[in-house]
């Protein structure tokens, strides 16, 4: 089973319930809609930090990449088989120390969830 | 706020190589995989290439396979595409495209940089 | 490698009205995870493309929610509720379920 960490840092739309019914489908890095194209919020929203217990794959532990970031949720769809109860969710959560964090000025304020059967785009083209 | 901005387009001939820039901002670049998208003028959208965060996994299209390069330098928060034996048809705007999920290439391309001319003529 | 292939190739539409932009792909494009990998991307005028939807049906982040993403396997579908004048551009489909990335020609779509 294959895990990807996810990431958003300036999520407008998170609330409580969207990360509940929406932990299914991975979430978007939301950064990538405050790009040179005009799309995206500007804000920093506060929202609880948060990680899965379960290690992620050896592929997604790289050199340039082992360590853990965050980030906030913005999914309107679900996809009913993936999602998760809130019970499952609950259960995954991890608080980690700020020097667990080791994050960016600009990342600071964040969830992580990572995507239970998300293969990555080379796994899926081998 | 995320940017990227791509550079080292310009006038070509063809033959020759050509090595295009794509400096970046405002996330962790060493975490994030990176794409390259090209447009013709006046054309659709074509992938070019990716690498992944690490750099150890690259792909690229068809058309540039075995002439282009894709390389990054993530001490320096730049992405590279070094483009040879280049020709007419590699004439385009090149766009370097962030992957949205981090430490994982998704193949989904969140954030693009505003591109960066090639023109490849005698 | 994966074709796809849009249609219409132009939309002209009336501001309030609804839009419809359909994708097929030469392959299905469900993965064994049970997402669909295809993506929506809109390129307003003058401007970088810009994600609108990714695996099937779900809405970047800031984009309205008068836009849905549909469908499943070889067959999408990209609705806009009521189109406004922001909207107009041309809109792609991409599959992300392998290598080489592959778009859609464009749709056009722009208001009567």
């Known amino acids: 089973e294959s895990r990807a960490e996810l990431t958003s840092d300036k999520d407008m739309y998170l609330d409580n319930s969207s990360i509940e019914e929406a932990s299914g489908v991975y979430p978007i890095d939301d950064d990538d809609y405050a790009s040179a194209s005009g799309s995206g919020a500007d804000e920093d929203v506060e929202s609880p930090e948060l990680t899965t217990s379960r290690p992620l794959p050896k592929i997604l532990l790289t050199s340039a990449a082992p360590k853990v970031e965050t980030t906030t949720l913005n999914i309107q769809n679900k996809i009913p088989a993936q999602t998760k109860s809130p019970e499952e969710t609950d259960k995954e959560k991890v608080h980690l120390s700020d020097s667990e964090r080791k994050m960016d000025p600009a990342e600071e304020d964040t969830n992580v969830y990572t995507e239970k059967h998300s293969d990555s785009l080379f796994k899926r083209t081998e | 706020e995320v940017q990227l901005v791509e550079s080292g387009g310009g006038l070509v001939q063809p033959g020759r190589s050509l090595r295009l820039s794509c400096g970046v901002s405002g996330f962790t670049f060493s975490s994030f995989g990176m794409h390259w998208v090209r447009q013709a003028p006046g054309k659709g959208l074509e992938w070019v290439a990716v690498?992944?965060?690490?750099?150890?996994?690259?792909n690229y299209g068809d058309s540039v396979k075995g002439r282009f390069t894709v390389t990054r330098d993530n001490s320096r928060n730049t992405l590279f595409l070094q483009m040879t034996s280049l020709r007419p048809e590699d004439t385009a705007v090149y766009y370097c495209?962030?992957?949205?999920?981090?430490?994982?290439?998704?193949?989904?391309?969140?954030?693009w940089g505003q591109g960066t001319l090639v023109t490849v003529s005698s | 490698d994966v074709v796809m292939t849009q249609s219409p190739l132009s939309l002209p539409v009336t501001p309030g009205e609804p839009a419809s932009i359909s994708c097929r792909s030469s392959q299905s494009l469900l993965y064994s995870n049970g997402y669909n990998y295809l993506d929506w991307y809109l390129q307003k005028p003058g401007q970088s493309p810009q994600l609108l939807i990714y695996l099937g049906s779900n809405r970047a982040s800031g984009v309205p929610d008068r836009f849905s993403g549909s469908g499943s396997g070889t067959d999408f579908t990209l609705k806009i509720s009521r189109v406004e004048a922001e909207d107009v551009g041309v809109y792609y489909c991409?599959?992300?379920?392998?290598?080489?990335?592959?778009f859609g020609g464009g749709t056009k779509l722009e208001i009567k």
């Open positions: 495209a962030k992957d949205v999920v981090r430490g994982h290439t998704s193949g989904s391309l969140g954030s």
């Open positions: 690498i992944s965060n690490d750099a150890l996994h690259k």
């Open positions: 991409m599959q992300a379920l392998q290598t080489p990335l592959t």
